[in-house]
């Protein structure tokens, strides 16, 4: 049994880091493998992650971490029984993938303005709370070409757009994702999408 693709990990910079790797053949990850991880810190204790299958030869492990900060560095040991298959390290702050925003809502009752709001996925005491920027994706269910991205570079988790910038009388969907420049993160996953029917009064033409 050998590791074909070494583990690569990303952290949500809050409580979970996710590591993925590939073995050289079909593997029952949860019964055959264990990923041990330990913070390089005084008094830290070793923890064991039981991986799950992610495709035939792929494995994924969700590492639980408390109080993640920039100084943290973890040692990783991948074991198959008594055999050490791979040894490495992981610094969560250098591989951050933010959590996806939640509770995306479209408010259509503001005079010909669409107000989209969502929730910041981090608590106020997490460093990323005040450092997320967002991308909002809006698209038409009827017209695949009607697809647009709005970059929200301010901190408030909301976006206002004129309803008239979208076509009237048809259904749209929206979703939002986040990233943080301070840690040069990757983009988060998209939030679940929300749907609304866009309708507004056309200006009266003589």
């Amino acid at each position: 049994m050998k590791v074909l693709q070494e583990p690569t990990c990303v952290s949500d910079y809050m409580s979970i880091s996710t590591c993925e790797w590939k073995m050289n053949g079909p593997t029952n990850c949860s019964t055959e493998l264990r990923l041990l991880y330990q913070l390089v810190f005084l008094l830290s204790e070793a923890h064991t992650c039981i991986p799950e299958n992610n495709g035939g030869a792929g494995c994924v492990c969700h590492l639980l971490m408390d109080d993640v900060v920039s100084a943290d560095n973890y040692t990783l040991d991948l074991w198959a029984g008594q055999q050490l298959l791979w040894k490495g390290s992981f610094k969560p702050s250098e591989h951050v993938k933010p959590r996806a925003p939640g509770n995306l809502t479209v408010h259509t009752n503001v005079s010909d303005t669409l107000l989209l709001t969502w929730s910041n996925p981090y608590p106020p005491d997490n460093y990323l709370y005040n450092h997320l920027t967002y991308a909002v994706n809006i698209w038409s269910e009827n017209d695949p070409a009607d697809f647009r991205i709005y970059n929200v570079t301010y901190l408030e988790p909301s976006l206002r757009i004129a309803a008239s910038t979208l076509k009237s009388g048809i259904s749209y969907r929206a979703r939002v994702r986040a990233w943080a420049q301070c840690y040069n993160t990757t983009w988060s996953e998209w939030s679940p999408s929300t749907k609304w029917h866009n309708s507004y009064r056309e200006p009266f033409e003589q």
Epitope: E45, D66, D67, A71, Y127
Partner: antibody, heavy 116, light 111 residues
């Protein structure tokens, strides 16, 4: 919100021991290390040691080895710091502080006076 | 126990900028992260800066930290009378056994 409530002031004679408590609330007690530091009157901060409330393991500053004992009670989310063989130079305010690489939250401090 | 060196005192008028230095060595600041603590008279220390330059929520952006080599600096702009306090830098000494160490402390007077 996070609160670290320390026990009240103590007056001790040289050679005696003192046990200071620090009751934590507002967070997952076993998820954060607890440090102890002290500050003599008009002096700076001095680190004494650290305890991992999860397993109870400890590490002490060399200066206090053999004289200090840190323990915890997970049922009450309380950590304790006991200092023995007290001398006059141990007169100080003793602080518990939650954190790992840095100390996020501090107790208000417990004044321990050592005097004959 | 090694100590980080800070100036005993600094002073400036309200509205001005002041900086407080913290000098260490390769076994501490040079190889670790720096934090800063504010201690108002008669109170416990409070975390002001961590991770060299990050502010906990609730700390105004008048306070900033930086690190270069084996020294670190705390800068306070738009000084207010309420900033009058003792300031301590902190880091980890990575010699064996590793342990946190604090600076000697700086008394800030707002004139």
């Amino acid at each position: 919100q996070v609160q670290l409530v320390q026990s009240g002031a103590e007056v001790k004679k040289p050679g005696a021991s003192v046990k200071v408590s620090c009751k934590a609330s507002g967070y997952a007690f076993t998820s954060y290390y607890m440090h102890w530091a002290r500050q003599a009157p008009g002096q700076g901060l001095e680190w004494m040691g650290i305890i991992n409330p999860s397993g109870g393991s400890t590490s002490y500053a060399q200066k206090f080895q053999g004289r200090v004992t840190m323990t915890r009670d997970t049922s009450t989310s309380t950590v304790y710091m006991e200092l023995s063989s007290l001398r006059s130079e141990d007169t100080a305010v003793y602080y518990c502080a939650r954190g790992k690489w840095w100390l996020y939250d501090w107790g208000k401090g417990t004044l321990v006076t050592v005097s004959s | 126990q090694s100590v980080l060196t800070q100036p005993p005192s600094v002073s400036a008028a309200p509205g001005q900028k002041v900086t407080i230095s913290c000098s260490g060595g390769s076994s501490n600041i040079g190889n670790s992260y720096v934090s800063w603590y504010q201690q108002l008279p008669g109170t416990a220390p409070k975390l002001l800066i961590y991770d060299n330059n990050k502010r906990p929520s609730g700390i105004p952006d008048r306070f900033s930290g930086s690190k270069s080599g084996t020294s670190a600096t705390l800068a306070i702009t738009g000084l207010q009378t309420g900033d009058e306090a003792d300031y301590y830098c902190g880091t980890w000494d990575t010699s064996s056994p590793p342990q946190p160490i604090f600076g000697t402390g700086t008394k800030l007077t707002v004139l």
